[in-house]
Interface confidence: medium
């Protein structure tokens, strides 16, 4: 038989079968049964969840479905000492104390095990003293706070609104200020849209809503007490002083209730410009304390919660492939929730069910496809990616050897405007060509194709008449697979037309307020977009794992690396007569991207021409695209982030969510002007241009002829 | 090579003025915040002025003891920081020397002497 | 204003003997904090900066060390052209403030 026959047992089995497949209301039904109690991570709630899941992936027809257990390090609130942040006066008594808990949303006042809003991993400290208010806590909010304000954090609380970046960044900026707390909060500026009522009566946040979420600086490492290896049985612990990532300080969340209270009374500077202001009616001073009349008032925080090893579950499914079964496309998504988990995580779980669901259904008729799909529901994603990472660090290799592709599947959706996409440049041309084939469920699109309502509403910045495709960052599942192992990787997800309030997410996003009613009430009642995420990520899948040649293409690396190389060249000539003074030529990294061009041109040249049914010569063909993307990791790492070996890609070392392009030759340039060591400094960009351009050598001698 | 050159410095009576110019070289002076620091004879070192990039919005900070009487300034197209000293005291007396950023290179120094 | 107070202020060495010099800021400071070197009639030139960090061109008998309010200068092996008035300073926050200097001197 030829491969193509193997895969396909009637010509009923394609892409089309599998997508017909795929029911909206299969999904509404899914996702009403995934988000009727909590599933916080080392839960008994989440592990009977993971054996509902395991069970029912069993039923759907996959091949095996196993759980994958790991004891790793997490963190819960003291259920006899809350956590709270009071003001105190001189005497030290507590003349106000923010809330303890979110007020229920209704129908759910009677649902036990409801975590109170809280940082994860926080220490546990009760600080007091004087407020700084630090806008986004951002790197230049602490530089107009230091540098052009003079106002110093060392030994003061500081209050921070939640959006922007990672909230993990903005605790780091804050120790590295010398802060001794940080009260994070939500501002109606970036959490509640203008003419949309809060919940329960629109999708906005109410005052005593808060966002929950950890506040780790992991970069990648996983498990804090085992970096690069899995928290199994036998695993070797450090101590909690060793461990990676914690924080340092008493970290808190709140809502815009309780920060009117400490806002309110701010005296000291005033913001220095309208970017500091947020939407309360409050001055936005930004201190350092109270003024005038409560000049002697303090605030002081009270942090009790615990950091303790516990069991994760994750669920691993194989649907075996017929003709490459020692090759991996996966698809997961996460299945640890901070509350109820209406959107973040089970919107995408919902998804990934009805998928499988398709899949088994294929496979029940005799169908199989070309290549292994392993598909993967994981656990404590919410606690810095554990559940995923863990289960990468113990098959890290036979996933170097064998991962095709890796598709990531959280949240579906954050808003229901328009498709958003972040992936490697090699599914550049799979997702056009998929999204092409689909009909958009927007309005006024009736009849066209997704491709087409996607490039309306989100044009791409430098390709007319192509939609937007972001580069992968971090802050998910993931980031293992592409950040450390080099796995080409995708996510797709239907979004808000909120482009300037990229990375604050929606408005309920980690309170309790995230329930199943708010997405079949406010956001997609239809779940219509639901089914059109289904069918991107799922026929993203079928693509990677049926298609006889991968679905990569390798020019479009080309044209980025030309992209990425322009950008950071046109970063450091803002510094001409330091590139004269330290030699610093760009010369070798266009050398490497012309080089990556010409042999990329050439490989898609032959991939046109060669002899697909000769398996050996399709079988080295495939192999040069599935390692390609394997040829951009660095085995030492970048500067001080081990775990982040991608030298194309990397997550921003001031916000985990957004990605950076060359992220070692940013990062040296970065503040460069503000380095005490210029020769040092300009060394050291030097040295990442060397291995920038070694790297991109290395990876376009991968695609040459082999012999 | 970075390198920065004062000039302007000498005798002046009490309560008169003074201009001092340090002329940069070697690196991209524009990016770079410039301080002026001063040294009376056999003392130790007191930090004056600086301003900022203009990036920065050209933001000057002062040391209190020349607030009101003394401005620091920057020609970006001359690679050149000022330090306009009015209303001079005698306890101004000292060697001026201009600093990069954090102090990491120094000029040679230009005498100011304030006497009657 | 945060002040900088250095100790001893002055020291008599050998050449070849290890000098340690102490900086005392009045409050944290992180590591902001450099040492710098000064010979009569020239002017001061940094040897260390962010508390441990030798700056270029600077030998490695040089040393800093320390953060938040104790900071240390040692000199291994000291050599003819060390003798000098070394002052530590810290950039932390406004005022920039130095330390009185110390004076090491031959014995």
């Known amino acids: 038989k030829s491969s193509n026959e193997a895969t396909n047992i009637t010509p009923k089995h394609n892409m089309k079968a599998f997508l017909d497949e795929l029911k909206a209301e299969n999904i509404k039904k899914f996702l009403y049964n995934f988000t009727q109690i909590p599933h916080l991570a080392g839960t008994e709630q989440n592990f009977q969840l993971a054996k509902q899941i395991q069970s029912q992936w069993k039923e759907f027809g996959l091949d095996s479905v196993e759980l994958a257990h790991y004891d790793v390090l997490l963190s819960y609130p003291n259920k006899t000492h809350p956590n709270y942040i009071s003001i105190i006066n001189e005497d030290g008594n507590e003349i106000f104390n923010t809330s303890l808990f979110e007020p229920p949303p209704p129908g759910y006042e009677n649902v036990s095990d409801i975590v109170p809003p809280f940082s994860a991993f926080s220490p546990q400290g009760m600080p007091e003293g004087d407020l700084v208010y630090v806008n986004y806590a951002r790197t230049e909010d602490f530089f107009k706070l230091e540098r052009d304000m003079k106002i110093n954090c060392s030994g003061k609380i500081v209050i921070a609104r939640y959006g922007k970046v990672f909230r993990g960044n903005k605790v780091k900026n804050a120790q590295l200020a010398g802060a001794k707390g940080v009260i994070l909060y939500s501002d109606p500026a970036d959490y509640f849209a203008p003419g949309v009522k809060s919940y329960p009566d629109g999708w906005n946040l109410p005052g005593g809503g808060v966002q929950r979420g950890n506040i780790l600086n992991l970069n990648g490492a996983g498990d804090p007490l085992t970096p690069g290896y899995p928290a199994n049985e036998y695993a070797y612990r450090r101590g909690i002083a060793e461990a990676v990532g914690l924080p340092s300080i008493p970290v808190h969340p709140i809502g815009y209730y309780d920060a009117q209270k400490l806002l309110e009374k701010m005296g000291g500077s005033a913001p220095p410009d309208s970017s500091w202001r947020g939407s309360l009616k409050v001055p936005y001073n930004v201190g350092p304390g109270f003024t005038g009349n409560f000049s002697t008032q303090k605030v002081k925080m009270h942090i009790h919660s615990t950091n303790e090893v516990t069991r994760i579950y994750n669920v691993i499914g194989t649907l075996r492939g017929a003709v490459e079964p020692d090759r991996y496309v996966i698809l997961g998504g996460h299945r640890d929730s901070w509350v109820f988990g209406g959107i973040d995580p089970q919107s995408g779980a919902a998804v990934v069910h009805e998928i499988v669901r398709s899949f088994g259904t294929l496979k029940k008729e005799g169908w199989r496809p070309r290549r292994t799909i392993l598909f993967a529901s994981w656990d404590a994603e919410e606690f810095g990616l554990l559940g995923s990472t863990e289960w990468a660090e113990e098959n890290s290799r036979l996933l170097q050897e064998r991962g095709v592709a890796y598709i990531n599947a959280d949240s579906s959706i954050e808003g229901n405007y328009t498709l958003r996409v972040d992936c490697t440049p090699l599914m550049y041309s799979l997702v056009h060509n998929l999204t092409k084939e689909l009909k958009s469920p927007d309005e006024g699109f009736e009849g066209k194709s997704l491709y087409e309502s996607w490039t309306k509403k989100s044009p791409s910045p430098e390709f007319s008449g192509m939609p937007r495709i972001s580069k992968l960052g971090s802050g998910n599942d993931f980031e293992v697979f592409f950040q450390r192992l080099g796995i080409a990787s995708g996510r797709a997800r239907y979004t808000k037309n909120w482009e300037t309030n990229k990375f604050s997410g929606y408005p309920l996003y980690h309170s309790v307020y995230e329930t199943y009613e708010l997405v079949e009430k406010f956001y997609d009642p239809m779940f219509k977009y639901h089914l059109t995420v289904a069918q991107v990520r799922g026929g993203m899948v079928f693509e990677l794992a049926n298609s006889i040649v991968l679905p990569f293409d390798c020019r479009d690396y080309a044209v980025v690396l030309r992209k990425y190389a322009d950008k950071i060249y046109s970063i450091s000539m803002k510094h001409p007569q330091e590139m004269k003074t330290y030699s610093v030529s760009f010369d070798s990294l266009f050398s490497a991207v012309k080089n990556f061009t010409e042999i990329a041109s050439k490989f898609s040249e032959r991939l046109q021409d060669f002899d697909k049914s000769n398996p050996i010569v399709l079988r080295m063909m495939n192999d040069q695209l599935m390692f390609l993307e394997r040829a951009f990791i660095d085995p030492l790492g970048l500067p001080d982030r081990p775990f982040y070996r991608h030298v194309i890609y990397a997550p921003s070392s001031h916000n985990k969510y957004a990605g950076e392009s060359f992220p070692g030759i940013y990062d040296a340039l970065f503040d460069i002007e503000s380095k005490v060591d210029p020769s040092k400094a300009w060394g050291e960009v030097k040295r990442q241009i060397y291995v920038a351009a070694f790297t991109v050598q290395a990876a376009a001698e991968t695609l040459s002829e082999v012999a | 090579e970075v390198k920065l050159v004062e000039s302007g410095g000498g005798l002046v009576q009490p309560g008169g003025s003074l201009k001092l110019s340090c002329a940069a070289s070697g690196f991209t002076f524009s990016n770079y915040w410039m301080n002026w620091v001063r040294q009376a004879s056999g003392k130790g070192l007191e930090w004056v002025a600086e301003i900022r990039s203009q990036s920065n919005n050209f933001a000057t900070h002062y040391a209190e003891s020349v607030k009101g009487r003394f401005t620091i300034s920057r020609d970006d197209s001359k690679n050149t920081v000022y330090l306009q000293m009015n209303s001079l005291r005698t306890e101004d007396t000292a060697v001026y020397y201009c600093?990069?950023?954090?102090?990491?290179?120094w000029g040679q120094g230009t005498t100011v002497t304030v006497s009657s | 204003n945060i002040v900088m107070t250095q100790s001893p202020s002055s020291v008599s060495a050998s050449v070849g003997d290890r000098v340690t010099i102490t900086c005392k800021a009045s409050e944290n400071v992180g590591t902001y904090v450099s040492w710098y070197q000064q010979k009569p009639g020239t002017a001061p030139k940094m040897l260390i900066y962010?508390?441990?960090n030798r700056f270029t061109g600077v030998p490695s008998r040089f040393s800093g060390s320390g953060s938040a309010t104790d900071f240390i200068l040692t000199i291994n092996n000291l050599q003819p052209e060390d003798f000098a008035t070394y002052y530590c300073g810290q950039s932390y926050t406004f005022p920039y403030t130095f330390g009185q200097g110390t004076k090491v001197e031959i014995k």
């Open positions: 600093t990069r950023r954090w102090n990491n290179f």
């Open positions: 962010g508390a441990s």
